[in-house]
Structure formats: C-alpha cells, structure tokens
C-alpha cells in the first residue's frame, strides 16, 4: 500500500486485515445513531513477483509487476487494494434532525487484490 | 507506491502516469506478433486527507483515511489504484503455432483513484 512509510521488515503478501471502526472514534457519534461501529477491514501487503491466484491480480497488474522488476526506480509495484466491497445500513440524523436509514455502498472490505 | 517506504516528503497526489510497455522488453516478442507494445500507464501518488473528488475515493477509502490519521502506525493510507481499465487486442502465436487474435481485458489504465 501507499504507506510502506518506514518499515524495514519484509512485508507480508497482499491480503485483507481486520479493522473495527468505531464511529465515536471518528467523532461521528452525534449524528450516527446505529450501529456504534462496524468491521471495515483494510488491505495491505506486498504485490511482488510472481502474483499468484490469491492476489486477484488484473492483467495490468501482472504487466506492471514485470515492468517494475526491469525498472524499479521509475515504475512502482502494483498496490494492494480492495477487490470486493460490501455496503452497510446506517441509522442517522439528517440536517433537519430527521432519523434516516440509509445504505452506504463500498464500506466493508471483503477481499483484496493487486491492482 | 509500495516502494516509498520511508519518505517524509510530500508525494504528489494519486494520478495516472504515462507508461509505454514494449513487448520486446518483457521478452514476449517471440509469441506476440502485434502490437509491438502499448500504452499501459500506471497509477501512483498519495491518497492523503482530504480525499477530493478527483481521487475517485470509495466510502471505505474515506473512512480508512480518517482511521489512518488517528492511527498511522497500524492502518495505512488507502492506495492509488486503477479505477478504469481498457482492453487491448493482441495477435499472437499459440502453443501450436496458430495465429490467434485475442482481446485481453484490463490491460490499459484509463483512470486512477484512492482505494
């Protein structure tokens, strides 16, 4: 992912990591009634050669990986990103203090891949 | 990108970069007849707060960005990945030396976003 900011260890391969997000931690508790939080998850890890089947790599990611190996200073590796996302339903107050139930798309990471 | 592991400088924002891929450089010239190469492009750049409209961010990416701000050591920023990909047609020799024209999906990056 874009944030391999200061690690000196070997990164694990691209995969889904568990992450619970609390709406209170985000400061959203005053307008979100329910749920109190949700399992958002996130993607992280290396997209290194060879990209195996578990990595859900696109054709472009495979080509980019090969170009990176030839030209690592100018072309980055593909990055580990969500390939499947789910929605969640949220009960919240709108600007007029009405209680609204709304489905928010692309909120939960179900699967990750190299893109 | 995955290799900007320890930088403290500001990277440019997530965007599409031009990249021409030569099939000869990849060592594929013996089986790919045409084209000789193609404009594959790639995505690179920061997915930093705030994620503006140009960054084609998903709801999950927006949430992840906020969690990263609270907890940068454990949760990475979203990564800059293709949001739109195009196919290319390739003329090649198969294992039996037949000439085949095939459309390969997801070969060209048309747009990038934060995921």
């Amino acid at each position: 992912s874009a944030s391999d900011y200061n690690s000196s260890e070997l990164k694990t391969a691209c995969r889904k990591h568990e992450l619970y997000v609390s709406f209170q931690d985000l400061g959203w508790q005053d307008w979100i009634i329910a749920p109190k939080g949700y399992a958002a998850n996130y993607c992280d890890g290396e997209c290194s050669f060879p990209l195996n089947a578990h990595m859900n790599a696109t054709n472009h990611a495979i080509v980019q990986t090969l170009v990176h190996l030839m030209n690592p200073e100018y072309v980055p590796k593909p990055c580990c990103a969500p390939t499947k996302l789910n929605a969640i339903s949220v009960l919240y107050f709108d600007d007029n203090s009405n209680v609204i139930l709304k489905k928010y798309r692309n909120m939960v990471v179900r699967a990750c891949g190299c893109h | 990108s995955a290799s900007d592991y320890n930088s403290s400088e500001l990277k440019t924002a997530c965007r599409k970069h031009e990249l021409y891929v030569s099939f000869q450089d990849l060592g594929w010239q013996d089986w790919i007849i045409a084209p000789k190469g193609y404009a594959a492009n790639y995505c690179d750049g920061e997915c930093s707060f705030p994620l503006n409209a140009h960054m084609n961010a998903t709801n999950h990416a927006i949430v992840q960005t906020l969690v990263h701000l609270m907890n940068p050591e454990y949760v990475p920023k979203p990564c800059c990945a293709p949001t739109k990909l195009n196919a290319i047609s390739v003329l090649y020799f198969d294992d039996n030396s037949n000439v085949i024209l095939k459309k390969y999906r997801n070969m060209v990056v048309r747009a990038c976003g934060c995921h």
């Epitope: 030839m70 | 930088s7 400088e9 920061e46």
Partner: antibody, heavy 121, light 111 residues
Framework: QVQLVESGGGLVKPGGSLRLSCAAS????????VHWVRQAPGKGLEWVGR??????????AYAASVKGRFTISRDDSKNTLYLQMNSLKTEDTAVYYC????????????WGQGTLVTVSS | QSVLTQPPSVSGAPGQRVTISCTGS?????????VHWYQQLPGTAPKLLIY???ERPSGVPDRFSGSKSGTSASLAITGLQAEDEADYYC???????????FGGGTKLTVL
Amino acid sequence: QVQLVESGGGLVKPGGSLRLSCAASGFTFSSYVVHWVRQAPGKGLEWVGRIKDHKQGYTTAYAASVKGRFTISRDDSKNTLYLQMNSLKTEDTAVYYCARVERSKSGFDNWGQGTLVTVSS
Amino acid sequence: QSVLTQPPSVSGAPGQRVTISCTGSSSNIGAGYSVHWYQQLPGTAPKLLIYGSSERPSGVPDRFSGSKSGTSASLAITGLQAEDEADYYCQSWDSSQTLVVFGGGTKLTVL
C-alpha cells in the same frame, strides 16, 4: 554531454557534519532518480541512498548504516543533488559518488568523479 | 558483508574467456529483479557495463555479456585484453523495500 560533478568533501572530526553537492548538466535533471554511492579506501561499492524525481514526489530512501544521520535533498532549479552528513563516524570515510539512474532499465548510467570524505580525529 | 556474493578475484590470460558470478537470494535476484554490472578501472569512477541483466550500453564491446538465472547472474568476458584489468561489481534490488544492493566486487587480473 551528461556530467555529474561532486564537491564538498574534506577532513572532518568524528561527530562533525559535512554537506556534499553534486552539480548535474547535459540532461533534464528534474526527471531523473539520483543516488549516492560510497567506496571506502580499498573496499567495494556501498549504496548510501537515493532521491526520486519530481513525478514521484522526491521520495528518499537510505541504507541502514546511514539512516537518521544522512539526508538527501535536491534543488531542481539549480540542477543540484545534496548529501547532508551529520554525526559522522570514522567508518564513513570514503569516496562519495553521485549517480544518475537511466529511465528504461534503472541502471546507474552516469557517475560523478567522486569526492573524498575523511573522518578522523 | 555484501548482500550479493562475488568471487574476490578471477584471472585469465589474454585472449581467454573468464566469467564472474554474482549470487543473490529470493529477495533480490531471485525475486526477478534485473542485474547490472559495473567496471571500475583503477583510480576512476564505476562505469555501466551491462544493464537489464544482459544488455550492453552503446560503446561497450560485445566481448562483454551478461546472463541471469534463478538467484544468480554472471558476467562473461571473451577475448580477454590487458585493458580489461579492473574491479567488476554486480548490482540489483532488494524486493522488500526496493533498496539497491551491490556485490562485494571482483578483481580481474589479466596474466
């Protein structure tokens, strides 16, 4: 033609600081990744670090042996690469080279002549 | 201790063929990264000799060739000449963070 010229080397005491410069000419400096490589007397080449081009946000990386002590920067308007060296140790004594990375296969296709840094009390 | 392993020295008579090996691991050469070779004549800066594992920059004689297989690479010099006497270094990248790695260098002596 492509030219890289290092300067700023000299004698410095342990714990001291020094700033090396590498003046580039004959090419579009801002579009290239550039590195520092050093060579201790009678020894092999050792990678020090690099700074990427403007397109890649000038991101830096360093060898473990210099991380936290050395800082690489560049000024594209002056076509110059810098290496700020702090908390110098005797083992930092070496000829320091700057090198340009060619854009198709990432080889170091042009090197400066080197500048000698001697760390001694 | 260098990440890439080269023999400290090799030698050959004029006209002979010599090879210099460069052995890495699954995190560098074995990860698929290209290998570059540099020639350093006495008292001078290194010069790119082979790039992309097997390609020669313009001006480099075809007596010099490079190859790569698995976790190692090699540089071959045919028709050895006195002016080939120099130090030779291989270079690649480490896949965990795309950091540059060098071999320890090989001193070529022309007998």
